[in-house]
């Protein structure tokens, strides 16, 4: 069977939504009313990987686009990027590790840890309109906690 994928949106713990910023970047900003339609809808796939009650391996694609969040080394630093893939082959149950995030939920907080780079998380800045990035610190200035809203297909 193919991998099961469900549509969702994400907001950081400051209630900032995620929107496209150019063809290969996401940014986080506060949206209201009709502007909420700008927010990115992810297709979250439940992929193969180590799983527990609090930790579920997922891949985060952009709905109806052949773009996936992936984690790679750039200048020796773990970096978040939007990577284009062949839609004939993706999504799949056995995603390459760079595409896999551990969705971790503990005490009303949802984090997305890179499977490729443990202890590196999808992060947003406190400031408005800044890029979504891969951060190596939790509990500091940068935001690593999210809420998730599933949406109908």
């Amino acid at each position: 069977a193919p991998v099961r994928s469900l549509n969702c949106t994400l907001r950081d713990s400051q209630q900032k939504s995620l929107v496209m910023s150019g063809p290969y970047e996401l940014k986080a900003l506060h949206l209201q009313g009709q502007d909420m339609e700008q927010q990115v809808v992810f297709s979250m796939s439940f992929v193969q990987g180590e799983e527990s009650n609090d930790k579920i391996p997922v891949a985060l694609g952009l709905k109806e686009k052949n773009l996936y969040l992936s984690c790679v080394l750039k200048d020796d630093k773990p970096t978040l990027q939007l990577e284009s893939v062949d839609p004939k082959n993706y999504p799949k149950k056995k995603m390459e590790k760079r595409f896999v995030f551990n969705k971790i939920e503990i005490n009303n907080k949802l984090e997305f840890e890179s499977a490729q780079f443990p202890n590196w998380y999808i992060s947003t800045s406190q400031a408005e309109n800044m890029p979504v990035f891969l951060g190596g610190t939790k509990g500091g200035q940068d935001i690593t906690d999210f809420t998730m809203q599933f949406v109908s297909s």
Partner: antibody, heavy 119, light 107 residues
Framework: EVQLVESGGGVVQPGRSLRLSCSAS????????MSWVRQAPGKGLEWVAY????????YYPDTVKGRFTISRDNSKNTLFLQMDSLRPEDTAVYYC????????????WGQGTLVTVSS | GIQMTQSPSSLSASVGDRVTITCRAS??????LTWYQQTPGKAPKLLIY???TLADGVPSRFSGSCSGTDYTFTISSLQPEDIATYYC?????????FGQGTKLQIT
């Protein structure tokens, strides 16, 4: 023994609000996703709200989106459904159920509480 | 979303009969299907998940199978306590929807 006990149902006028509660026992509540499923009189089943085990994930179908809000208090083993702008078509027995988006099915159910929306 | 069409809507059978209920999905749901039993005045009860896995404590006379997008629920030998309405439900894509139900009566 798993027990889910709903409360808070009753008769309410269209446009008004109601808050349902579900008290859980017999399992570790904070480890389970939870949902509300409703059944209009003599009709079938409809899933109306979901919340993940920690409370960070939610889902509502289009029929109730923007009007219903699901929440939970894991310290009190209690699930809630805040229902605003109620309509006559919201009249139903509302069941609290264990399960949701990830597992996909509901393996434990409460006995239900009847909500009647009528002027 | 995916619609589940359940048939028949009602049926009568005798104790000891083999009873079959069918659910047809409007799209492929890859065995992400559940069956519930609801006895009169009670809450639904999980019987089968993943199309053919029996839930804990469910008698072995109940079973599930599939062929393509058609899913079948079978009671091999009907018992008086099986008087109920049976529902299928898919959980492949949101919204997860239920079939309309099949009311089973004993003749």
């Amino acid at each position: 023994e798993v027990q889910l006990v709903e409360s808070g149902g009753g008769v309410v006028q269209p446009g008004r609000s109601l808050r349902l509660s579900c008290s859980a026992s017999g399992f570790i509540f904070s480890r389970y996703d939870m949902s509300w499923v409703r059944q209009a009189p003599g009709k079938g089943l409809e899933w109306v709200a979901y919340i993940s085990h920690g409370g960070a994930g939610t889902y509502y179908p289009d029929t109730v989106k923007g009007r219903f809000t699901i929440s939970r208090d894991n310290s009190k083993n209690t699930l809630f459904l805040q229902m605003d702008s109620l309509r006559p078509e919201d009249t139903a027995v509302y069941y609290c159920a264990r399960g949701g988006v990830y597992k996909g099915y509901f393996d434990e159910w409460g006995q239900g509480t009847l909500v009647t929306v009528s002027s | 979303g995916i619609q589940m069409t359940q048939s028949p809507s009602s049926l009568s059978a005798s104790v000891g009969d083999r009873v079959t209920i069918t659910c047809r999905a409007s799209g492929n749901i890859y065995d992400y299907l559940t069956w519930y039993q609801q006895t009169p005045g009670k809450a639904p009860k999980l019987l089968i998940y993943n199309a053919k896995t029996l839930a804990d404590g469910v008698p072995s006379r109940f079973s599930g199978s599939c062929s393509g997008t058609d899913y079948t629920f079978t009671i091999s030998s009907l018992q008086p306590e099986d008087i109920a309405t049976y529902y299928c439900q898919h959980f492949w894509s949101l919204p997860y929807t239920f079939g309309q139900g099949t009311k089973l009566q004993i003749t």
